[in-house]
């Protein structure tokens, strides 16, 4: 699986999850998030060679097409597969609110 | 929606579904598919600017991050959203077989 366990431990050029820390205030300009100050959102990148973690029959076909026709611009792309939520604390006036934001952290990638 | 109805009628630079005809024999080297000779698989391509058809909270956050930090290498990618099956005819010996291959035709795209 192209997950953090594998990808963070290996120098992998092909599609894999990469570490990306986002500071809410500095990187996004969000002052409203009180806690945490930032988080590892991570992201997916890298080429999708033939049969690499293909998501659908279409991505398998497109991967084969791209391998046989390397001049073609059509190829699968490395995108998030498994995501996890992030719990944040913010304020509305003086009232603290705790909210779980779904699909905030990329844990693994796929070729789609 | 970034679907064939919209994308095939407009000169759209950003994420959209693009027409791609694949000839089974010529493009994939598949001689075993008897009918059809080929089909429109289509593919997704184009940049994913801020808020464009974002798939998850992560892709929204990543789109904002990329807009504010354009030198960053992390950005959402344009990938298939809705796919349709394709029915094919092939032979096992002299016995004809009809099979429906799932997720073969891209009908719309999203930024993931």
């Amino acid at each position: 699986a192209l997950d953090t366990n594998y990808c963070f431990r290996n120098l992998e050029e092909n599609c894999c999850v990469r570490p990306l820390y986002i500071d809410f205030r500095q990187d996004l300009g969000w002052k409203w998030v009180h806690e945490p100050k930032g988080y590892y959102a991570n992201f997916c990148s890298g080429p999708c060679p033939y049969l690499r973690s293909a998501d659908t029959t279409h991505s398998t076909v497109l991967g084969l097409y791209n391998t046989l026709n390397p001049e073609a611009s059509a190829s699968p792309c490395c995108v998030p597969q498994d995501l996890e939520p992030l719990t944040i604390l913010y304020y509305v006036g003086r009232t603290p609110k705790v909210e779980q934001l779904s699909n905030m952290v990329v844990k693994s990638c796929k070729c789609s | 929606a970034l679907d064939t109805n919209y994308c095939f009628r407009n000169l759209e630079e950003n994420c959209c579904v693009r027409p791609l005809y694949i000839d089974f024999r010529q493009d994939l080297g598949w001689k075993w598919v008897h009918e059809p000779k080929g089909y429109y698989a289509n593919f997704c391509s184009g940049p994913c600017p801020y808020l464009r058809s974002a798939d998850t909270t992560h892709s929204t956050v990543l789109g904002l991050y990329n807009t504010l930090n354009p030198e960053a290498s992390a950005s959402p990618c344009c990938v298939p959203q809705d796919l349709e099956p394709l029915t094919i005819l092939y032979y096992v010996g002299r016995t004809p077989k009809v099979e429906q291959l799932s997720n073969m035709v891209v009908k719309s795209c999203k930024c993931s």
């Epitope: 300009g29 002052k31 409203w32 913010y90 509305v92 909210e99 | 808020l51 956050v61 904002l64």
Partner: nanobody
Framework: QVQLVESGGGLVQPGGSLRLSCAAS????????MAWFRQAPEKQRELVAL???????AYADSVKGRFAISRDNAKNTVYLQMNSLKAGDTAVYYC??????????WGQGTQVTVSS
């Protein structure tokens, strides 16, 4: 009920200036990232300028150095100062409010026409 009301559009000569305003109601304005998009005839809606809840800004390459986005949280209003206007800036300009915890909201748009 959320409302975004744009104003300030109109007809202006090339090289002239306009200031667009977008007044928001029904949202916790200070939490929202605010943006201006525009749509010219037969073209896709495109981002012009963005200002986050904390005041971080970004601009489309085509307007950098000419347009300036700002916000006034006390007045629940976002502004777009447009200078050195060109014919290519002609479009309907839309205000957008986005917060990651809710859906995004759009204004009805204001027409900007740059012509001599």
């Amino acid at each position: 009920q959320v409302q975004l009301v744009e104003s300030g559009g109109g007809l202006v000569q090339p090289g002239g200036s306009l200031r667009l305003s977008c007044a928001a109601s029904g949202i916790t304005f200070s939490h929202y990232d605010m943006a201006w998009f525009r749509q010219a005839p037969e073209k896709q809606r495109e981002l012009v300028a963005l200002i986050t809840s904390g005041g971080k800004t970004a601009y489309a390459d085509s307007v950098k150095g000419r347009f300036a986005i700002s916000r006034d949280n006390a007045k629940n209003t976002v502004y777009l100062q447009m200078n050195s206007l060109k014919a290519g800036d002609t479009a309907v300009y839309y205000c957008n409010a986005h917060w990651v915890l809710t859906s995004q909201y759009w204004g009805q748009g204001t027409q900007v026409t740059v012509s001599s």
